[in-house]
């Protein structure tokens, strides 16, 4: 049998977000992401060798970053997507979130937007990803399948707290971010409030509790009177353009 | 250094109630939710639920709606889980979990 | 019954290479919700080994690994030691429950 009961133990850790399926219970608030990296003390700290960070989406990613399959090739292979860096300007794209932010996707390719044209997340031409029933499957030219929005127009949206896949799961104003236990509708964050960005390639595979990005007109940059601290303790805050 | 600290063992007869407590230091305790998963003697896990640990808002498993009350007091940093009208086969280790940590457990034990 | 199946019992030799699979359904595994995996020695809560299919936190050694297929999830533990010998458990969550769940549970043993 397994273990007979348990008597003593260190404060063990691990698991994390809320739940309540697609429809969440009204209500059920849960905290803007801490967006905690893994620290020291017995907490898990960074993962022992940086691997390519597994995705299904691109919220999964940094906001330099977007999810697809590492070659075009390479879909087969498992069907695994890793966060990419972004393209730049003039590169072409497929959807807005493959471009550096600053930039969205018209016509295929990376062009400037003056103001956040489209938050991470959003529709371009009303189209949605879909990655089916298989969390990490690809479609054969290496990105996500993707499938028009009427599929999704009698799903309830999320509230804050609800387990979700992706963005689209979740109400206006949330995006879907990581929570260690799966993935929760948390608030797209406002003007001033501390955000994550990920400087160094592959950082944000530490994040468990995972911060949305910052909402339309706004950029995460860091905060004016952090400038001297030094690289590791700048903070970030979502700034207007 | 995070830290989940329950207390200790309980022993309660049949058709009473329980209330387990978790107390929470080393981190901001409103930014997180605290989860209450529990292990039978020789058994495997389940989840009771959580509590957001801001707001107060609860979510049940549904074996345990009925019986269950999740609260919280951020002044003292406390998670608490409430199990009314026990029988035999609730007794098991209760732990609660900010979900990256586990407290010790809690050993309640139902016997007549 | 457990909404993820997990085999009750697995063994190994030392040195040798084990897995453990963790078996759902479209509603949990198969619908893209992530898996975790725990480690839990006798009287201990339970350990992360594997978050999210397939990460690792610090300290846990790359013996351990994760992957997944479809609605089925796996451990692979390579170079076996006698201080495996634990239980493992799987967990997802499951949106026709709307819960969290755990496999049943596997007792790893190593053979001496």
């Known amino acids: 049998t397994l273990n007979s009961v348990l008597i003593n133990s260190n404060a063990i850790k691990n698991l994390p977000p809320p739940l309540g399926g697609a429809g969440g219970q009204p209500g059920s608030a849960v905290s803007v992401a801490p967006g905690v990296l893994y620290e020291g003390g017995n907490k898990y700290q960074t993962l022992d060798n940086y691997q390519p960070y597994p995705c299904a989406e691109d919220e999964e990613c940094g906001s330099d970053e977007y999810c697809s399959s590492p070659s075009r090739g390479a879909a087969g292979v498992g069907g695994v997507q890793i966060c990419l860096a972004c393209r730049k300007r003039r590169k072409r794209c497929m959807r807005h979130a493959m471009c550096c932010p600053g930039n969205y996707c018209k016509n295929g390719i990376c062009m400037p937007s003056d103001h956040s044209h489209f938050p991470r997340g959003e529709i371009e031409e009303s189209i949605i990803e879909n990655l089916g029933n298989d969390h990490n499957a690809a479609a054969g030219d290496g990105y996500p399948r993707r499938t028009t929005l009427t599929s999704k127009i009698y799903h309830t949206k999320g509230q804050e707290g609800s387990v979700c896949l992706r963005s689209s799961d979740c109400a206006a104003g949330l995006c879907c971010a990581r929570h260690f236990w799966s993935k929760i509708c948390k608030p797209v964050l406002k003007e001033g409030q501390v955000c994550t960005k990920h400087k160094r390639k592959g950082s944000h595979g530490l994040e468990i509790f995972q911060r949305c990005y910052c909402g339309e007109g706004l950029a995460c940059r860091i905060q004016k009177d952090h400038h001297q601290a030094s690289n590791s303790s700048r903070l970030h805050t979502c700034q207007r353009h | 250094e995070v830290q989940l600290v329950q207390s200790g063992a309980e022993v309660k007869k049949p058709g009473a109630s329980v209330k387990v407590s978790c107390k929470a230091s080393?981190?901001?305790?409103?930014?997180?939710?605290i989860h209450w998963v529990r292990q039978a003697p020789g058994q495997g896990l389940e989840w009771m639920g959580w509590?957001?640990?801001?707001?107060?808002?609860?979510t049940y498993a549904q074996k345990f709606q009925a019986r269950v009350t999740m609260s919280r007091d951020t002044s003292s940093s406390t998670a608490y889980m409430e199990l009314s009208r026990l029988e035999s086969d609730d007794t098991a280790m209760y732990f609660c979990?900010?979900?990256?940590?586990w407290g010790q457990g809690t050993l309640v034990t139902v016997s007549s | 019954q457990s909404v993820l199946t997990q085999p009750p019992s697995v063994s190994g030799a030392p040195g040798q290479r084990v897995t453990i699979s963790c078996t759902g359904s479209?509603?949990?595994?198969?619908?893209?919700?992530?898996v975790h995996w725990y480690q839990q020695l006798p009287g201990t809560a339970p350990k992360l080994l594997i978050y999210?299919?397939?990460n690792r936190p610090s300290g846990v050694p790359d013996r351990f690994s994760g992957s997944k297929s479809g609605a089925s999830a796996s451990l692979a533990i390579t170079g076996l030691r006698p201080d495996d010998e634990a239980d493992y458990y799987c967990?997802?969550?499951?949106?026709?429950?709307?819960?969290?769940?755990f496999g049943g549970g596997t007792q790893l043993t190593v053979l001496s």
């Open positions: 979990s900010r979900e990256d940590y």
């Open positions: 080393g981190y901001t305790f409103t930014d997180y939710y």
């Open positions: 509590i957001h640990s801001n707001s107060g808002a609860t």
């Open positions: 479209s509603s949990n595994i198969g619908a893209g919700y992530d």
């Open positions: 999210g299919y397939s």
């Open positions: 967990q997802s969550y499951d949106n026709s429950l709307s819960s969290y769940v």
